[in-house]
């Protein structure tokens, strides 16, 4: 489900860029961090790829956006939206948000100044 995103800059241009990149490695990387290496999560076999490899693939994908820095918040919001229904309780939601906000730093990007992840209409 795609929702209106973006608080910073040209949101429609960011939305197009976010649409073009594959956010799955980022989603898998975060799920790996919060579920632990030993657990399989949903349809992803998160044990098949080491966490560091997954993180690198995630960073590479984010780098594919023309305006990585400017569109970072929209990318994080989309990852949250994509995974929202898979998060089974509020503690998991909090962990996911925390790991998500750490993602830019892990990829050596600047963290967005303001990025509201509570954008899923009460779903997450």
């Amino acid at each position: 489900m795609r929702r209106e995103r973006g608080r910073q800059g040209d949101s429609s241009s960011c939305e197009r860029q976010v649409d073009r990149v594959n956010l799955k490695p980022c989603e898998q990387h975060i799920m790996q961090r919060i579920m632990g290496e030993q657990e399989q999560y949903d349809s992803y076999d998160i044990r098949s790829t080491r966490s560091s490899d997954q993180q690198q693939r995630c960073c590479d994908e984010l780098n594919e956006m023309e305006n990585t820095q400017r569109c970072m918040c929209e990318a994080l919001q989309q990852i949250m939206e994509n995974q929202c229904d898979r998060l089974q309780d509020r503690q998991m939601v909090q962990q996911f948000k925390r790991e998500l906000m750490n993602l830019p730093q892990q990829c050596n990007f600047r963290a967005p100044q303001r990025c509201d992840l509570d954008v899923s209409g009460g779903r997450c």
Partner: antibody, heavy 115, light 107 residues
């Protein structure tokens, strides 16, 4: 399977304090948040708040700020509820309960406040 | 605060009947809703989490549906063992309000 075992019934005088424990087993303690719920005699369930077992950050419902404290001892997989300045209206059964797909309830602890 | 309104407050039905309890949230809660069953003198137990997921070990005659503000718990064929009070509970990050409960009796 998930099991939550609470401490036994308590009788206290008004103004005293009580600490209820909730020992978890059968799952990774830090995986699910722990809720505390109050049920006064003959009444419905009242959500008191929850504590994130990863960060130990408590969240209290509006009516349960001040005299109520949630805490954890992750080394023994136990959550605690402490109530200070007890009043007669605190007489109730207190339950701990986990969130999520493994959602489970403790058996309850009756706290009676009477002079 | 999010308010949860359950209806009816009491329900009387015959063994084998299909029974429906509804729960309405004062604002959208997505699918962050659980249903609990409490039999007299015992602790509640979780039946349904995240609106429609049946907790393992719970009989398949129980089902949950809904999202946003309107939710339903259905017992497809009421059994004597189902006599209890049923509570809905919303559980977002900052709150966890319960409905006032629905007492289910056998006619």
């Amino acid at each position: 399977q998930v099991q939550l075992v609470q401490s036994g019934s308590e009788l206290r005088k008004p103004g005293a304090s009580v600490k209820v424990s909730c020992k978890a087993s059968g799952y990774t303690f830090t995986k699910y948040g722990m809720n505390w719920v109050r049920q006064a005699p003959g009444q419905g369930l009242e959500w008191m708040g929850w504590i994130n077992t990863n960060t130990a950050k408590p969240t209290y419902a509006q009516d349960f700020t001040g005299r109520f404290v949630f805490s954890l001892d992750t080394s023994v997989n136990t959550a605690y509820l402490e109530i200070s300045g007890l009043k007669a209206e605190d007489t109730a059964v207190y339950y701990c309960a986990t969130d999520g797909s493994e959602g489970s309830w403790g058996q309850g602890t009756l706290v009676t406040v009477s002079s | 605060d999010i308010q949860m309104t359950q209806s009816p407050s009491t329900l009387s039905a015959s063994v084998g009947d299909r029974v429906t309890i509804t729960c309405r949230a004062s604002q959208s809660i997505g699918t962050w809703l659980a249903w609990h069953q409490q039999k007299p003198g015992t602790a509640p137990k979780v039946l349904i989490y995240k609106a429609s997921n049946l907790k393992s070990g719970v009989p398949s005659r129980f089902s949950g549906s809904g999202s946003g503000t309107d939710f339903t718990l259905t017992i497809s064929s009421l059994q004597p063992d189902d006599v209890a009070t049923y509570y809905c509970q919303q559980y977002n990050t900052y709150s966890g309000t319960f409905g006032q409960g629905t007492r289910v009796e056998i006619k």
